[in-house]
């Protein structure tokens, strides 16, 4: 094959590898014909004058996970057919200038995971051709005005993982193709308007896990094709009325782990794609009327962990798609009985852990697909009679931890309880709270008649007619029924958002995520 | 280890009824967005559906839109597909898979079960 | 619906050789594309995310470069394993639509 060198592999593709610690300096001498070059794992501190002259065919190389933390400026003279190089994952401080000279064919560029504390415009100026720059995981604290006006071609742009404190408006504004833009995981503290306004192609843009406290209101006006944008995890405490206005392609956006107060009527519009919208973790205090009419298509809707104590009737007008409303962990104390009436495909409702009181009879009254509630731990006493009899798919509904008062106002109840008990789950029964010597009771089991005993019991009717018979056919199978335990995509519901569940220098959507690339 | 097990597949006419379950295990399956996808003989991946981790987002590819139903219990770590008036063309093995995605650009089905074979035919 | 095409519905290498499979979408896609192996009588595994990221324990010969419409596999020195069957698969909307595949085989 040319001359392989002793500590490397060569394949009669002219591919080849060299990795090993006892590997301290660029192997010689390599293959002439050498296409692809990966130099990884070993103990090389440094890159010197011209390694790869004689390898001029070389179209990728990768020098990662080395102890690389000094390259001479003409280390890759002689690459002018170089495609992709890669130098991430080593101990890089600095980039000397011109190091990229004569790199005419570099599409993608690979600098991340290294401990860079600044880029320069010289450092690509001559990397007209580049499509990928991955700048991610370094330490740098701003990036100078002009650093990638050469870079007219680059579609992807990742500089999550840094220190950046600012963005200047100007920085991006040459970068008419670029698709994805990642500054997730920095320090910035608020976006300049006019900042995104050059990226006309822009599909995604991920600001995640920064410190932004104010969005401009014409902040993505011109990325009318922006189809993901992630918010979360900042310090936003409020969203100007016209800042997501045109976006029409969006069907990802993330806002949880923020400081929003209030959403304005139409905020989130018109937004055909969007199915998904999370706004846990925030300080919303209350829904006015319309607030996600535009969104038509939305089928999860999470709105838990906030402070809401009022949602107007027509919070959620528009909201015909929807199936799954998290409300949880809120300050709700009463509800209007039209609050739902729009969500006829609903059918999953969390209101557990709020302060609501009592339920208006025809809270569910439209909502008849309904497959699970969640009602625990509220200030609920009793609930109104036959308020579940139209829920005929009504298969998990969770009551516990309220104080039930066990009078005979309770009885039919607990008469609907003891015939709908599978309904209830196993792991807790509601019991009574009160009067005194009842209390603990199991409210299915409970005799009301002892709990009371100078109160005459009248009869009165089972609570809804239509008992629950696990075989009946109208039923689903419970297996078919979504868990509500809540841990919607990105998990909000009892997870520390902090921790992050990696698997192999990548995690799901379980918490914050922690992905290069 | 990180596995799943589809199980329900098997001859039923056209117009019947099967229902397929995925059991999961090995990860935290409350976590993961789920899809199944399906492949006929002899041909490529068709993506079938998928269902957001808490089962409220729903996906459906139009060539099974209101004869197939996914669904999942996270309490049983089990992913369904119940699939209604069958045709011939649904004749496939059926893969579940985990959609794994992220806010960093991991977007993948990173974990397949082995498929199960479904054949529809009078 | 975004449409996937690959290209070449088939090839034939031999061992050692170098191969780009190419695949294109109907519309932009960004980097949300993904490419996967698929052995005989098994199921599919992942082998690039992100258009270019290499899925963790996947060999390093195997790599992934495009963004937008134009997308590219590339295996830099096949092996006799590597001769199956290659998918791609765009996950930038619903919904997620494969390509037809290429068939690598041995010359």
């Known amino acids: 094959y040319h001359g392989c060198p002793s500590e490397c592999t060569c394949s009669r593709a002219s591919q080849v590898e060299c990795t090993g610690a006892r590997i301290v300096a660029v192997p010689t001498p390599l293959p002439w014909n050498a296409m692809s070059l990966q130099i990884l794992n070993t103990h090389i501190t440094e890159l010197n004058e011209s390694p790869f002259l004689n390898i001029s065919a070389l179209i990728a190389l990768r020098i990662e996970k080395n102890e690389l933390s000094r390259i001479t400026p003409g280390a890759f003279r002689n690459l002018g057919s170089l495609r992709y190089l890669s130098l991430a994952n080593n101990k890089l401080q600095v980039l000397p200038i011109g190091l990229f000279q004569g790199l005419d064919s570099l599409e993608s560029l690979l600098l991340s995971s290294n401990q860079l504390l600044q880029i320069q415009p010289a450092h690509f100026s001559q990397c007209s051709n580049l499509k990928e720059l991955q700048l991610h995981g370094n330490h740098l604290e701003y990036i100078p005005d002009g650093a990638f006006d050469h870079l007219v071609g680059l579609t992807k742009l990742n500089l999550g993982k840094n220190s950046l404190t600012h963005i200047s408006p100007r920085v991006f504004q040459h970068l008419g193709n670029l698709q994805v833009l990642r500054l997730y995981e920095n320090r910035l503290t608020d976006i300049p308007m006019g900042t995104f306004d050059g990226l006309v192609n822009l599909q995604e843009l991920a600001l995640q896990q920064n410190q932004i406290g104010l969005l401009s209101p014409g902040l993505f006006h011109n990325n009318h094709n922006l189809q993901r944008l992630y918010l979360s995890n900042n310090h936003i405490s409020q969203l100007p009325p016209s800042v997501f206005m045109q976006l029409p392609q969006l069907n990802r956006l993330t806002l949880f782990g923020n400081s929003l107060k209030e959403l304005s009527p139409g905020i989130f519009g018109p937004m055909p794609n969007l199915r998904e919208l999370w706004l846990y973790d925030n300080h919303i205090s209350s829904l006015p009327d319309n607030v996600f009419s535009n969104l038509r298509q939305l089928q999860v809707l999470i709105l838990s962990r906030n402070q809401i104590s009022f949602i107007s009737p027509g919070a959620f007008n528009g909201l015909t798609e929807l199936r799954e409303l998290s409300l949880h962990t809120n300050a709700l104390q009463d509800l209007d009985g039209n609050v739902f009436r729009m969500l006829a495909n609903l059918q999953n409702i969390s209101l557990q852990n709020n302060r609501l009181r009592q339920l208006p009879g025809n809270i569910f009254a439209n909502v008849n697909g309904l497959m699970a509630i969640q009602l625990q731990n509220n200030q609920l006493e009793n609930l109104p009679l036959g308020i579940f009899d139209h829920l005929g798919k009504l298969c998990e509904l969770r009551l516990y931890d309220n104080p039930w008062r066990c009078d005979s106002d309770i009885l039919p109840l607990r008469n609907w309880l003891l015939l709908n008990q599978p309904r209830l789950g196993t792991d807790t029964v509601p019991v009574c709270f009160s009067p005194a010597n009842v209390r603990g009771q199991s409210l299915i089991i409970i005799n009301v008649n002892v709990a009371v005993p100078s109160v005459h019991v009248p009869e009165v009717p089972s609570y809804p007619e239509t008992p629950w018979y696990p075989d009946t056919p109208s039923y689903p199978d419970t297996t078919s029924v979504s868990s509500t335990t809540e841990l919607t995509s990105p998990v909000e519901d009892y997870t520390d958002l902090t921790t992050i569940q990696v698997t192999d220098d990548r995690s799901v959507w379980g918490m914050t995520q922690a992905q290069s690339g | 280890q990180v596995q799943l097990v589809e199980s329900g597949g098997g001859l039923v006419k056209p117009g019947g009824s099967l229902r397929l379950s995925c059991a999961a295990s090995?990860?935290?399956?409350?976590?993961?967005?789920m899809s199944w996808i399906r492949q006929a003989p002899r041909k490529g991946l068709e993506w079938v559906s998928s269902?957001?981790?808490?089962?409220?987002?729903?996906y459906y590819a139009d060539s099974v839109k209101g004869r197939f139903s996914i669904s999942r219990d996270n309490a049983k770590n089990s992913l369904y597909l119940q699939m209604n008036s069958l045709r011939a063309e649904d004749t496939a093995v059926y893969y579940c898979?985990?959609?794994?995605?992220?806010?960093?650009?991991?977007?993948?089905?990173?974990?397949w079960g082995q498929g199960t074979m479904v054949t529809v035919s009078s | 619906d975004i449409v996937m095409t690959q290209s070449p519905s088939s090839l034939s290498a031999s061992v050692g050789d170098r191969v780009t499979i190419t695949c294109r979408a109907s519309?932009?896609?960004?980097?949300?594309l993904a490419w996967y192996q698929q052995k005989p009588g098994k199921a599919p595994k992942i082998l690039i995310y992100?258009?270019?990221s290499l899925e963790s324990g996947v060999p390093s010969r195997f790599s992934g470069s495009g963004s937008g419409t134009d997308f590219t596999l590339t295996i830099s020195s096949l092996l006799p394993e590597d001769f199956v069957t290659y998918y791609c698969?765009?996950?930038?909307?619903?919904?997620?639509?494969f390509g037809p595949g290429t068939k690598v085989e041995i010359k």
């Open positions: 992100d258009a270019s």
């Open positions: 698969q765009q996950f930038n909307s619903y919904p997620h639509t």
């Open positions: 269902i957001s981790n808490s089962g409220g987002a729903i």
């Open positions: 898979a985990r959609y794994n995605w992220n806010d960093r650009g991991y977007d993948a089905f990173d974990i």
């Open positions: 519309q932009g896609i960004s980097s949300a």
């Open positions: 090995g990860f935290t399956f409350s976590d993961y967005y």
